[in-house]
């Protein structure tokens, strides 16, 4: 960053997205400001509008092309400028030589469902957006249900530590709603983080069967 | 990369308004900050106005500000130029330019353009 009071962090989707975030303090909120990517060994440049988040951070989305088009490589390096406008002028305000796999952070997965349902187990599936084919199978999954009564930061975590878009629940309660959330995070990358959680897949156990224990 | 197609030029009298249109094809569509430009017969092509790709922020060359504006729906895929008390040195032919390098989009030579459309004001 040019300056102590400023942090500006990015991660790429591993195909064609980076997100920044950029804070500063006592930064305007009404100043015009864009990310600007300068790859080393591309022919595009790009830019994005960052909109404000909170009181003194901001957000935008370099969209490098289609959803599933795989804009960089791991011998790529972008370098991402922050520039605000002063005046007439335009201020280089943070800048970082970004190298796309050392800072990976794959979309939510999606396409939850539900497999199939019994009263004491549940098998889900889903499926990884817009993630490298360069992954081939090195990539981890966490997971987490939602019981009655409690909440997301009070489920264990279960860890799947291969490629496996799918888990069989067990030990569950009959005649039950639960909640289920699933991340997703390559091996790839030393500043590499987990994506954000899938939206919550809600499904119910079946009711045990009259006159069993 | 991205085809850009401009509509909605004509003949007015000045102090008339015109709305143009330019629809934005093959690629996706909010990378690009979008500008118009024009030339008059025998003048060189000019700046008009652009609008960032989140539509937040919107330049003007000075000679149309307050009667124009500039605008996009990124879910239509178009941008717009709202012409408004148009007067007789507004007559020029009309182009959109796409660039996803905002710095770069009164680049004439870098820009991706349409095929413009003709704007005449009439006294």
């Known amino acids: 960053a040019v300056n102590g009071t400023s942090r500006f962090t990015c991660f790429y989707n591993s195909r064609a997205n980076i997100s920044c975030v950029w804070s500063q303090d006592g930064a305007l909120q009404d100043t015009s400001c864009q990310v600007h990517a300068w790859p080393d060994r591309r022919r595009w440049n790009q830019t994005c509008e960052l909109l404000p988040v909170s009181q003194a951070s901001w957000a935008c989305n370099l969209i490098l092309g289609t959803p599933d088009s795989q804009k960089l490589t791991a011998v790529d390096i972008v370098t991402l400028r922050v520039m605000c406008r002063e005046g007439v002028r335009w201020r280089m305000m943070a800048i970082q030589d970004f190298k796309p796999f050392e800072n990976l952070r794959l979309m939510a997965p999606i396409s939850l469902q539900v497999v199939h349902v019994e009263t004491h187990r549940c098998n889900i599936s889903w499926k990884i957006s817009q993630a490298s084919h360069y992954f081939e199978r090195h990539l981890e999954f966490e997971a987490r249900t939602l019981s009655p009564g409690h909440t997301w930061e009070e489920a264990p975590l279960m860890t799947l530590k291969q490629k496996q878009e799918w888990i069989c629940l067990e030990t569950l309660t009959p005649d039950t709603q639960y909640e289920f959330q699933v991340r997703v995070k390559p091996l790839q990358g030393e500043f590499t983080t987990w994506s954000p959680w899938s939206q919550p897949l809600a499904f119910r156990t079946k009711p045990a069967a009259l006159g069993k224990d | 990369q991205v085809q850009l197609q401009e509509s909605g030029g004509g003949l007015v009298q000045a102090g008339g308004s015109l709305r143009l249109s330019c629809a934005a094809s093959g690629d996706v569509f909010v990378r690009y900050t979008m500008a118009w430009f024009r030339q008059a017969p025998g003048k060189e092509r000019e700046f008009v106005a652009s609008?960032?790709?989140?539509?937040?922020?919107?330049e003007y060359v000075d000679s149309v500000k307050g009667r124009f504006t500039v605008s996009r729906d990124n879910a239509k895929n178009t941008a717009y130029l709202q012409m408004n008390n148009l007067k007789p040195e507004d007559t020029a032919i009309y182009y959109c330019?796409?660039?996803?390098?905002?710095?770069?989009?009164?680049?004439?030579?870098?820009?991706?353009w349409g095929q413009g459309t003709q704007v005449t004001v009439s006294s």
């Open positions: 609008v960032t790709d989140s539509g937040r922020t919107t």
């Open positions: 330019a796409a660039n996803t390098d905002y710095f770069q989009i009164r680049s004439l030579d870098l820009n991706t």
